[in-house]
């Protein structure tokens, strides 16, 4: 039994780091493998992660962490029984994938303005809380070409757009994702999408 693709890990910079790897053949990850991880700290102890299958030869493990700070470094040991298959390390702050924003809501009752709001996925005491920026994706269910991205570079989790920038009388969907420049993170997953019917009063044409 050998590791074909070494584990790569990403952290949500809160409580979970996810490591993925591939074996050289079909493997029952949860019965055959264990990933041991330990914070490099005088008084820490090793924790065991039981991996799950992620495709035939792929495995994934969700490492539980109390919290994360920039200096944290973890040692990782991948075991198959008594055999050490791979040894490595992981610094969560250097491999951050933020949590996806939640509770995306479209408020259509503001005069001819669409107000999109969502929730910051981090609690206020987490470092990323004040460092997230967002991308909002809006698309038409009827017209695949009607697809747009709005970059929200301010901290407030909201976006206002004129309803007239979208077509009237058709249904739209929106979703939002996050990233943090300070840690050069990857983008989060997209939030679940939300749907609304776009309608607004056309202004009277003056002749």
């Amino acid at each position: 039994m050998k590791v074909l693709q070494e584990p790569t890990c990403v952290s949500d910079y809160m409580s979970i780091s996810t490591c993925e790897w591939k074996m050289n053949g079909p493997t029952n990850c949860s019965t055959e493998l264990r990933l041991l991880y330990q914070l490099v700290f005088l008084l820490s102890e090793a924790h065991t992660c039981i991996p799950e299958n992620n495709g035939g030869a792929g495995c994934v493990c969700h490492l539980l962490m109390d919290d994360v700070v920039a200096a944290d470094n973890y040692t990782l040991d991948l075991w198959a029984g008594q055999q050490l298959l791979w040894k490595g390390s992981f610094k969560p702050s250097e491999h951050v994938k933020p949590r996806a924003p939640g509770n995306l809501t479209v408020h259509t009752n503001v005069s001819d303005t669409l107000l999109l709001t969502w929730s910051n996925p981090y609690p206020p005491d987490n470092y990323l809380y004040n460092h997230l920026t967002y991308a909002v994706n809006i698309w038409s269910e009827n017209d695949p070409a009607d697809f747009r991205i709005y970059n929200v570079t301010y901290l407030e989790p909201s976006l206002r757009i004129a309803a007239s920038t979208l077509k009237s009388g058709i249904s739209y969907r929106a979703r939002v994702r996050a990233w943090a420049q300070c840690y050069n993170t990857t983008w989060s997953e997209w939030s679940p999408s939300t749907k609304w019917h776009n309608s607004y009063r056309e202004p009277f044409e003056q002749h």
Epitope: F41, L42, L43, E45, D66, V69, A71
Partner: antibody, heavy 116, light 111 residues
Framework: EVQLLESGGGLVQPGGSLRLSCAAS????????MAWVRQAPGKGLEWVSA????????YYADSVKGRFTISRDNSKNTLYLQMNSLRAEDTAVYYC?????????WGQGTLVTVSS | QSVLTQPPSASGTPGQRVTISCSGS????????FNWYQQLPGTAPKLLIY???HRPSGVPDRFSGSKSGTSASLAISGLRSEDEADYYC???????????LGGGTKLTVLG
């Protein structure tokens, strides 16, 4: 709410022994390393000893090595410090502290006086 | 003598910004993170800053920490009378397999 309550302090003669206890509540005791820190009257803080969550690894300050023994009973949520061959310079308030990178919660302390 | 050196005293007037330093000796390893504790008169110490610059929940953002090499600093802005206390820095020393604490700094709020 995290609470740490020390007990077992008192007056002891030089060369004598005492056993301090620290009853923990409000958190999962078995998941946290613990430590003892002391403070002599009018002096600064001095780290004494620390123990990992399972008790597998133990550390002592040079000043107490060979005389003090730290231990824990995770089933009772209690930390202990057995102090033998006590000296006058061990006179201090002894604090029990939870460890999460630093000493993030402290008890109110128990006074140990070593005097003849 | 502590391997972490702090000034024995510091002072400031209400509203001022005060900084307390904590210096490791030249041979002190710079890999560890610094922590800061506040001890109000007659009470147990309380964690103020951990891992160089992180504040536990409940600690006002008037308190901030920073690290440079083997030294660290605690800054208190908008000084208040209730900040009058002893402040200690500390760090895990992996060469000693133990925890080292500075001698403490007594902060006095004047006037």
């Amino acid at each position: 709410e995290v609470q740490l309550l020390e007990s077992g302090g008192g007056l002891v003669q030089p060369g004598g022994s005492l056993r301090l206890s620290c009853a923990a509540s409000g958190f999962t005791f078995s998941r946290h390393a613990m430590a003892w820190v002391r403070q002599a009257p009018g002096k600064g803080l001095e780290w004494v000893s620390a123990i990992t969550s399972s008790g597998r690894s133990i550390y002592y300050a040079d000043s107490v090595k060979g005389r003090f023994t730290i231990s824990r009973d995770n089933s009772k949520n209690t930390l202990y410090l057995q102090m033998n061959s006590l000296r006058a310079e061990d006179t201090a308030v002894y604090y029990c502290a939870r460890v999460h990178r630093a000493f993030d919660y402290w008890g109110q302390g128990t006074l140990v006086t070593v005097s003849s | 003598q502590s391997v972490l050196t702090q000034p024995p005293s510091a002072s400031g007037t209400p509203g001022q910004r005060v900084t307390i330093s904590c210096s490791g000796s030249p041979l002190f390893p710079d890999s560890g993170s610094f922590n800061w504790y506040q001890q109000l008169p007659g009470t147990a110490p309380k964690l103020l800053i951990y891992a160089d610059s992180h504040r536990p929940s409940g600690v006002p953002d008037r308190f901030s920490g920073s690290k440079s090499g083997t030294s660290a600093s605690l800054a208190i802005s908008g000084l208040r009378s209730e900040d009058e206390a002893d402040y200690y820095c500390g760090t895990w020393d992996y060469s000693l397999s133990g925890y080292v604490l500075g001698g403490g700094t007594k902060l006095t709020v004047l006037g």
